[in-house]
């Protein structure tokens, strides 16, 4: 079997949802060492970066300018060190926002509800649209779809303290084209007394695992890395 | 804004060489990434050669060896030598650029530029 590298880690700097006409950063970490890393979109040659000194960095960052619909859609990255390549990293799914509208988010019964009542949100895109999308802040991986020509609802169920926060919505013209985000709607549960010191409050800041961990090796580094090489030697 | 105006083709006999020229107005030269494409009577747009703000460059297969690329930050103008020459290399020749870029990217995909000249047309034939 062909011989291939570990996989690279892909993640998207700050965001990957990115306004149009503003700048994605996409980091792609694999290995010290790495001569050349490339950008892969939709299955087609994006970018290449070819790193200097390559044994003193990890990774990569490859910008994205002037972001818009033509741009949006799936990355992913590899590497290659000496002649041999790594494996595919993980797709990573780009999204274009401030397209066209802005929706209007409306949550019912109100925005502020008790523990264990049923809440919905809909939200609202007179503009041709089919999909609407359902995001809460800080947590903006877990996205609810919901479909209707100009209104979807968001079924949320009885609710718990977890489900506090800002709400916010998008149209979507495809996977990949969203429209401006709604104004927020900020959900407040009460009850659960028991459990509200447990419920942390959502982050303002974007999520947290969007960021690009790429480090300079130092010297140090580069001799514990020896030694610890050295040493595995030995034991063996 | 940037302006990207393309110069230097022609028609030439198979075996030959070119160097096409991409004169770029404005004092975003230096921050842009630049690539040139090209364009065959009823094919595809597809990507020739690409060269990163620091000068590192990345070739097609179909021409590695045979076409070089180059820019003169002091000239604001980005070049593609071109020896060897096929009849297949006979096209519309566009010059394009990423503005503005970080880093070293050197940018293969069509839709990552977001400036285009109009073009120059190589002909190559006996």
């Known amino acids: 079997p062909k011989q291939t590298l570990p996989k690279p880690i892909i993640r998207a700097e700050s965001t990957y949802m990115v306004p149009k006409e503003k700048q994605a950063t996409l980091c792609c970490q694999g290995s010290y060492g790495a001569v050349e890393y490339q950008l892969h979109f939709e299955g087609s040659l994006f970018a290449v970066e070819r790193p200097k000194p390559p044994e003193r960095i990890n990774g990569v960052k490859f910008h994205i300018p002037d972001m818009n619909s033509r741009k949006a859609g799936r990355y992913s990255c590899i590497y290659r060190v000496g002649e041999l390549w790594s494996e595919r990293s993980d797709l990573l799914d780009l999204v274009v926002t401030e397209m066209y509208d802005t929706p209007t988010l409306s949550v019912h019964p109100g925005p502020e509800v008790t523990s264990g009542e049923k809440v919905t949100f809909y939200c609202r895109l007179d503009t041709a649209t089919s999909m609407f999308l359902l995001l809460k802040e800080g947590r903006s991986r877990d996205v609810q779809r919901s479909y209707g020509k100009v209104q979807a609802e968001f079924p949320m169920g009885p609710v718990t303290t977890a489900h506090r926060g800002s709400y916010r919505c998008f149209g979507s013209y495809n996977n990949y084209a969203w429209s401006f985000p709604s104004e927020p709607v900020k959900l407040l549960v009460t009850g659960d007394i028991e459990n509200t010191s447990l419920a942390p409050t959502d982050p303002t800041f974007p999520d947290s695992w969007d960021t690009c961990l790429l480090t300079r090796e130092t010297g140090l580094q580069k001799d514990l890395a020896l030694w610890d090489h050295t040493a595995q030697n030995l034991l063996r | 804004e940037v302006q990207l105006v393309e110069s230097g083709g022609g028609e030439v006999q198979p075996g030959g060489s070119l160097r096409l020229s991409c004169a770029a107005s404005?004092?975003?030269?230096?921050?842009?990434?630049m690539g040139w494409f090209r364009q065959a009577p009823g094919k595809e747009r597809e990507f020739v050669a690409a060269i990163s703000r620091s000068g590192d460059t990345y070739y097609a297969d179909s021409v590695k060896g045979r076409f070089t690329i180059s820019r003169d930050n002091a000239k604001n103008t980005v070049y593609l030598q071109m020896s060897s020459l096929r009849a297949e290399d006979t096209a519309v020749y566009y010059c394009?650029?990423?503005?503005?870029?970080?880093?070293?990217?050197?940018?293969?995909?069509?839709?990552?530029?977001?400036?285009w000249g109009q073009g120059t047309l190589v002909t190559v034939k006996p």
């Open positions: 404005g004092r975003t030269f230096a921050s842009a990434a």
């Open positions: 394009a650029a990423v503005v503005p870029t970080y880093g070293n990217n050197i940018y293969v995909h069509s839709a990552a530029y977001n400036y």
